[in-house]
């Protein structure tokens, strides 16, 4: 469990021409405030799917009345931060949607009305625990400046909030792989149910008493550094220095090749490299001429016209060896980049490539927004394997060129009336309702249909929602 | 080639903390985790602990109260501190590739005495 | 924790005789990625520990291989399949099966 914390630090117009109309006038005085939507992953999800990570209300900013003849300044913003709290593991990778809501003051019959000014969408990585992230989005010609971070609730700790913590047992120290919880520094990481001593780092269990090793390391306790030199050959020259803990006696102790062969192991049993003049299993069989037929998969045979002479093999691409009888081992030559698996299927090549990068070799960064250009004030978003713009309201496309009818849909609920605006729609909600679609009832005395004030909040403030 | 070299005073006084330091060289320390490993004269090996550079630690349940490892990448070292030292701690300690224990340092005999 | 027990702890040996050390643990060792990880090591005078057999049988590089590994579950067998003088020393089974790891108490080999 934790808490998603968002600081606003301030809303106001973009750089660049065209700067939007003050929201709030002397006729219509107005305060401010905003809305996050959590949605765990890096799916591009519409706006309307649920907030599944959590969702929070600010509380609104002090009244605002626009000064005549003065360029919008940034707006004044309402205090504290707004807090989303999460009962399960932080995720890690999530969705987020940020609205800027007014409020208008003047003389409405029913109360307050509220309509929404922008709206920034984005996905991001993020690990609980770490520090505040900054972050600039846009929406139109608003600008929208905040910051964030996941922070876990006492007793769980970790980049997932997923391990928890406990008074401390021993006055001085924390017992057997077990570290203080920061900032708690009294308290201690609880046990894990993992199998004792296990590698926090690189063990992990899903039953009480196993102890899983992550990719690169191996051991009972998962501290011992995988080699795969010296896993390949441990009785290599370098086996002695690695610390890999290698399987028992490998196929090639002794070595089972005859006449001079040198063994390399494979996955399941071993493969002689004979001389010449020699082949077979072990390079047991000797005295070959081309007659013989000695050179494989389809390899042309040269010289060797009396078995004292050497003959040589001249073999076929993706074949090697005194005899052709290897297959080139393509994916050796790591031709593969970034990661990416290498796939040799005989006739050609394949990387599979990790997320966010593509090409061949997998040699092009898709998630590198430079030189990507996103109409309208959308905004270039990095992640999921591919670059893609995150479009203001009322855009949509590759590049958010296309201009979209946002009120088609009739998003408003509750009788709202829907108008294309700049930034995309707005739904102007009857009386007694509130929200980006008109979804929330209103009380009569103006607060929401939501849980009942934390403290230091005044009824009537919008609150937390899940 | 790994090689490990332990350091530290080799006289400690009753009830004081014990402190020593294992320098790393041919290898990063954030490579493996690393060990301690203590022989009193005459007697066997006990496993003490292992740490990793990230400060993960591991000790043994007969020494974990009084025991604290930590690690210095800037410098390729790490440390034991054995705080509360009795007569009984006198011994040679070795560090150690942990796990493998294949690479060990030429060990530091640390006396316990007043 | 688990007790490793060694036997004999003093092992006289004629120069080119065979030798051989046991170890037992209270638990067996075998874990479940089908591996025995039980160590072996070789402490000369004056010297580390120096270690000749992982894994319960595989020879560390530089290691002569009159030195083999056998057992399995609790019970486990240093050979030496024939004694020479720089062989002198106390050899310890360790088990990093199980956490704690322990070691046996040693086994003092010395030529007759």
């Known amino acids: 469990a934790g808490v998603f914390e968002l600081q606003i630090h301030s809303f106001g117009p973009g750089p660049g021409p065209g700067a939007p109309r003050s929201p709030c006038s002397a006729r219509l005085p107005c305060r401010l405030f905003f809305r996050v939507c959590l949605k765990p992953g890096l799916s591009e999800e519409a706006a309307e799917s649920p907030c599944a990570l959590g969702a929070a209300l600010s509380a609104r900013g002090p009244v605002y009345t626009e000064q005549p003849g003065a360029p919008a300044p940034d707006l004044p913003l309402p205090d504290g931060l707004l807090q989303v709290p999460f009962r399960d593991a932080w995720p890690g990778t999530f969705s987020f949607i940020i609205e800027t809501w007014r409020e208008e003051l003047g003389d409405q019959i029913g109360g307050p009305a509220w309509s929404l000014l922008a709206r920034v969408a984005g996905r991001r990585r993020l690990a609980a625990g770490g520090p505040w992230a900054r972050d600039i989005q846009r929406a139109g010609a608003w600008e929208l400046r905040f910051s964030y971070r996941a922070r876990c609730e006492p007793p769980a700790v970790g980049t997932a909030c997923t391990r928890l913590c406990r008074p401390r047992s021993a006055p001085s120290r924390c017992g057997p792989g077990l570290r203080p919880c920061a900032p708690l520094e009294d308290e201690c990481e609880a046990p894990l149910v993992c199998r004792a001593g296990c590698s926090p780092e690189h063990g992990f269990c899903e039953q009480p008493g196993e102890c899983r090793c992550l990719e690169g390391w191996t051991g009972p306790l998962c501290t011992v550094p995988v080699s795969t030199s010296s896993c390949l050959s441990p009785r290599g020259p370098s086996s002695a220095t690695t610390g890999c803990l290698v399987p028992g006696p490998g196929p090639c102790d002794g070595n089972p090749c005859a006449n001079g062969g040198s063994c390399s192991e494979t996955p399941r049993s071993f493969e002689c490299t004979c001389p010449r003049g020699f082949y077979g299993l072990r390079c047991e069989v000797s005295g070959v001429t081309c007659a013989d037929g000695p050179c494989f998969n389809g390899g042309l045979c040269v010289g060797g016209a009396d078995p004292d002479s050497a003959y040589i093999c001249h073999c076929p691409p993706g074949f090697q060896g005194s005899n052709c009888e290897k297959r080139v081992d393509r994916c050796s030559l790591q031709p593969c980049r970034n990661g990416g698996l290498c796939l040799d299927l005989g006739h050609a090549l394949r990387c599979r490539c990790r997320a966010g990068f593509a090409g061949p070799r997998c040699e092009h960064d898709l998630d590198d927004c430079a030189g990507r250009a996103c109409a309208n004030g959308g905004t270039c978003v990095e992640g999921g394997g591919a670059h893609r713009c995150s479009c203001a309201l009322g855009f949509g496309g590759r590049d958010c060129r296309e201009r979209a009818d946002p009120c088609a849909a009739r998003p408003c609920a509750h009788g709202g009336r829907c108008y294309a605006h700049f930034s995309g729609l707005v739904c102007a909600c009857a009386p007694g309702y509130m929200g980006a679609r008109c979804e929330f009832p209103v009380h009569p005395d103006g607060a929401s249909a939501l849980p009942a004030a934390p403290p230091g909040l005044r009824p009537g403030d919008p609150q937390r929602y899940l | 080639q790994v090689q490990l070299r332990e350091s530290g005073p080799g006289l400690v006084k009753p009830s004081e903390t014990l402190s020593l330091t294992c320098t790393v060289s041919?290898?990063?320390?954030?490579?493996?985790?690393w060990g301690w490993i203590r022989q009193p004269p005459g007697k066997g090996l006990e496993w003490i602990g292992y740490?990793?550079?990230?400060?993960?630690?591991s000790y043994n349940p007969s020494l974990e109260s009084r025991v604290t490892f930590s690690a210095d990448t800037s410098k390729n070292q790490f440390s034991l501190k054995l705080s509360s030292v009795t007569a009984a701690d006198t011994a040679v300690y070795y560090c150690s590739r942990e796990g493998s224990f294949d690479v060990w340092g030429r060990g530091t005999l640390v006396t316990v005495s007043s | 924790e688990v007790v490793m027990t060694q036997s004999p702890l003093s092992l006289p040996v004629t120069l080119g005789q065979p030798a051989s050390v046991s170890c037992r643990s209270s638990q067996s060792l075998l874990y479940s990625d089908g591996n025995t990880y039980l160590i072996w090591f070789q402490q000369r005078p004056g010297q580390s520990p120096r270690r000749l057999l992982y894994?319960?049988?595989t020879r560390d590089s530089g290691v002569p291989d009159r030195f083999s590994g056998s057992g399995s579950g609790t019970d486990f067998t240093l050979k030496i399949s024939r004694v020479e003088a720089e062989d002198v020393g106390i050899y310890y089974c360790m088990q990093v099966t199980h956490w704690p790891y322990t070691f046996g108490q040693g086994t003092k080999l010395e030529i007759k």
């Open positions: 041919g290898d990063s320390l954030k490579n493996s985790y």
């Open positions: 894994k319960l049988s």
């Open positions: 740490i990793y550079y990230s400060g993960t630690s």
